[in-house]
Each structure stands twice: as structure tokens, then as C-alpha cells.
């Protein structure tokens, strides 16, 4: 089975750890994809080690354990994010994550910094 | 983790053959695709051939029809039976390995992060 917190959020400019854990008696994992909604984020093959698709590579860290973390995080980042465990033999488990990600505190507390054009 | 050494590369006349092979080592699944990718000097890396998930294969165009990539999954072992030599195949051979299930079978090198040292091919006319 994958057991996995089914809703996180986290701020702006910061960072988040995706974790999913699998737990079987008979089942080892194989390989762990990760994916944000349809595009595939990165791969932990018990084979070849971590692979982080280039276009996150910038953002993205292998671990803790099998899973992520998104550092750098942005509105757009908001969303669903799918652990699928590929095991032998059982084949394959899935797990959904919905990150939620809001703006720093900072703004919210109307803290921001905007930049003041001379006057004159 | 996984290593791979190349072997059988050589010299050869343009019209012969050449069988290349690919031993992995120091993997517990042998769970992954593994390609042929060749390096000409002045050239860009070029993705030879593909091996995916369920035995499909993939070709580039300038081999296809000569060279035919097999796998012996119980030893882990990849070939490139290269036939119809020509001298533009003249390269440094390489094999990789990526993980399965990373979209389609294709020869983009982006997902293959473990290569051989490679074994050197030349066709001379």
C-alpha cells in the first residue's frame, strides 16, 4: 500500500518535501516515478540511481528516501503530484498529492517591497 | 549500481560486419532500456539504437536496415550486430541505460545517465 499526506501546502520562494511511503511484505520496489499532474518530474531506479528530468533540475532534489523535494516553488507549482511505485513482483502502486502553494507570508502581511519611482 | 563495458569494436572494410556487445554488471532487476549511441570526431552524439520495455526497438535512420540491436536479458548482455559497414559509421560506440517507463522508445539521450567507456569502430573504404 502507499500512504502519503493527500494535501500539503507550502509558500512561495520556499520548498517542499513530496514523500510517499510504500509498504508491502512480499513486494520490492523496483523503481519510483514521479510525475507533476502528466509531465514526468524524476525517476529512482533501484538499477541506475536518480534521474531528474533537465527542464527541473534547477528545483528539484532527490530525497529524503524516495522522495522529493521542490525548492524555488511558484504559483504554477500548485497542483497534483503522483508517486507510482513499481515493485517485484505485485506491480504497481499510486499515490496523489495535492500541493498547494500560497503566497509568503510576507506579502500577505503587506510586507512586500515595491520599488518607488522619484518623484519629479 | 549498474556498469556497462563495450566490446568487439575494430577495424573493418567498408561491405563487413561487426558484432558489438554490452555487458552490465552490478544490477539486482536489470529493469531499464539500454540504446547504442556512437560518437564521430567533429560530431554530435548520435543515438544508434533502442531496446524498451516489451523488446521494442528503435533505429536511426542512417543504420536502419544494417544494424539490429538484441538483448540477452537472463545475462544482461546488449548487441549491435552492424552489417553493410559503410565509412561514415566509423565512431566510438557507446551503450547506456535508462530507467523503463520514461515516455516512448525513443533515441533521445537525455535519460541515459549510465554509460560504458566505449570501443572504437572503423570502416575503412
Known amino acids: 500500500t502507499i500512504d502519503t499526506k493527500r494535501n500539503i501546502s507550502a509558500e512561495e520562494g520556499g520548498s517542499v518535501i513530496l514523500q510517499c511511503h510504500f509498504s508491502s511484505d512480499t513486494a520490492e520496489v523496483t523503481q519510483v516515478d514521479w510525475k507533476q499532474q502528466d509531465q514526468l518530474l524524476a525517476i529512482y531506479s533501484v538499477d541506475l540511481g536518480w534521474h531528474v528530468a533537465s527542464v527541473f533540475s534547477d528545483r528539484v532534489v532527490p530525497g529524503p528516501s524516495l522522495g522529493l523535494t521542490f525548492q524555488s516553488l511558484t504559483m504554477n507549482d500548485t497542483g497534483e503530484y503522483f508517486c507510482t511505485y513499481h515493485t517485484y513482483p505485485g506491480g504497481i502502486y499510486k499515490g496523489r498529492i495535492f500541493l498547494k502553494v500560497q503566497e509568503s507570508s510576507d506579502d500577505r502581511n503587506g510586507l512586500a517591497q515595491f520599488q518607488t519611482a522619484p518623484l519629479g | 549500481q549498474v556498469q556497462l563495458a563495450e566490446s568487439g569494436g575494430g577495424s573493418v572494410q567498408a561491405g563487413g560486419s561487426l558484432r558489438l556487445s554490452c555487458a552490465a554488471s552490478?544490477?539486482?532487476?536489470?529493469?531499464?532500456?539500454m540504446g547504442w549511441f556512437r560518437l564521430a570526431p567533429g560530431k554530435e552524439r548520435e543515438g544508434v539504437a533502442a531496446?524498451?520495455?516489451?523488446?521494442?526497438?528503435t533505429y536511426s535512420d542512417s543504420v536502419k536496415g544494417r544494424f539490429t540491436i538484441s538483448k540477452d536479458s537472463a545475462n544482461q548482455i546488449l548487441y549491435l550486430q552492424m552489417n553493410s559497414l559503410k565509412p561514415e559509421d566509423t565512431a566510438m560506440y557507446y551503450c547506456?541505460?535508462?530507467?523503463?517507463?520514461?515516455?516512448?522508445?525513443?533515441?533521445?539521450?537525455?535519460?541515459?545517465?549510465?554509460w560504458g567507456q566505449g570501443t572504437q569502430v572503423t570502416v575503412s573504404s
Open positions: 531496446i524498451c520495455s516489451g523488446g521494442r526497438t
Open positions: 552490478g544490477y539486482k532487476y536489470g529493469v531499464y532500456s
Open positions: 547506456a541505460a535508462r530507467p523503463l517507463w520514461t515516455g516512448d522508445c525513443d533515441l533521445s539521450s537525455s535519460w541515459y545517465k549510465t
